[in-house]
């Protein structure tokens, strides 16, 4: 297993949509063709896996159908967009990116993205 | 170094607005987030919001929301705060600071905005 | 909105000796997400403490923060004459993001 660099950003807001997108971008020693890639969520020091997908390079990325991640990949960066979140989910995200094939097998783990969540204020309510 | 470098001191009429500029050196401005802190004269200090550069969305105080408006210049590392309908309850010194993982730093070295008929 | 209450207001104290501050919030806050701050006069705040017990880089040993929940704590072990200042706590738990009132530590 050889060491790999990850670079995601240190801090995104998601929308008040609860939607959040933020690139993870590795270097690449060598060609791979097969990447995998898993954002884990730490909070409060448990982590606990968000999503995984596994791609072969110049392909989407296919996550599970009920998978709350969906991510586009270009060259050494991976695109990742999370939806559904609420203020409860704010938390560090981390990205992991495997090089599966060819070998040697290259492990990198992001320091993680900060995301912040917040609830939209509920609506008044409105006598009509 | 990191560094946020805030614009100068303003003077306003009530019921003007002012803008307050903070440039950000030493760092991937993109990756973090700024916000805007507030400090009346001899009082504690007041969160206002904050803005993540990394995609401008913004969270602001309830109780300035609709007068606040802040924003990122990617291309020259910049932040703005904009407060309009300004009252004399206004007058403070205003801070930007880097908003990281679960911390403010470094701030700003501050603007004094006077709110004054 | 979380409310953050610090005790006490003032505190008078000697170099030397130690400085123990309250920050008590009104709703449970993640330890991750509890800072301090210290404020002297016509200063900006210097980050001190983030997720409530590390020490923020160029800090001196002599800061430590603790605590969980609803109740943290910031020590200073030998107040030194760069220490008297105004410090302040924060949460970063749930919007709107809150400080304290602030505590005044001032030379006896």
């Known amino acids: 297993c050889k060491a790999m660099h990850v670079a995601q950003p240190a801090v995104v807001l998601a929308s008040s949509r609860g939607i959040a997108s933020f690139v993870c971008e590795y270097a690449s020693p060598g060609k791979a063709t097969e990447v995998r890639v898993t954002v884990l969520r730490q909070a409060d020091s448990q982590v606990t896996e968000v999503c995984a997908a596994t791609y072969m390079m110049g392909n989407e990325l296919t996550f599970l159908d009920d998978s709350i991640c969906t991510g586009t990949s270009s060259g050494n960066q991976v695109n990742l967009t999370i939806q559904g979140l609420r203020a409860m989910d704010t938390g560090l995200y981390i990205c992991k990116v495997e090089l599966m094939y060819p070998p040697p097998y290259y492990l990198g783990i992001g320091n993680g993205t900060q995301i912040y969540v917040i609830d939209p204020e509920p609506c008044p309510d409105s006598d009509f | 170094q990191v560094q946020l470098v805030q614009s100068g001191a303003e003077v306003k009429k009530p019921g003007a607005s002012v803008k307050v500029s903070c440039k950000a050196s030493g760092y991937t401005f993109t990756s973090y987030g700024i916000s805007w802190v507030r400090q009346a004269p001899g009082q504690g200090l007041e969160w206002m919001g904050w803005i993540s550069a990394y995609n401008g969305n913004t969270n602001y105080a309830q109780k300035l929301q609709g007068r606040v408006t802040m924003t990122t210049d990617t291309s020259t590392n910049t932040a703005y705060m904009e407060l309009r309908s300004l009252r004399s309850d206004d007058t403070a010194v205003y801070y930007c600071?880097?908003?990281?993982?679960?911390?403010?730093?470094?701030w700003g070295q501050g603007t004094l905005v006077t709110v004054s008929s | 909105e979380i409310v953050l209450t610090q005790s006490p207001g003032t505190l008078s104290l000697s170099p030397g000796e130690r400085a123990t501050l309250s920050c008590r919030a009104s709703?449970?806050?993640?330890?991750?997400?509890l800072a301090w701050y210290q404020q002297k006069p016509g200063q900006a705040p210097r980050l001190l403490i983030y997720g409530a017990s590390s020490r923020a880089t160029g800090i001196p040993d002599r800061f430590s923060g603790s605590g969980s929940g609803t109740d943290f704590t910031l020590t200073i072990s030998r107040l030194e004459p760069e220490d008297f200042a105004v410090y302040y706590c924060q949460q970063f738990g749930s919007s709107p993001w809150t400080f304290g009132q602030g505590t005044k530590v001032e030379i006896k």
């Open positions: 600071a880097r908003v990281g993982a679960n911390w403010f730093d470094p």
């Open positions: 709703q449970s806050v993640s330890s991750s997400y």
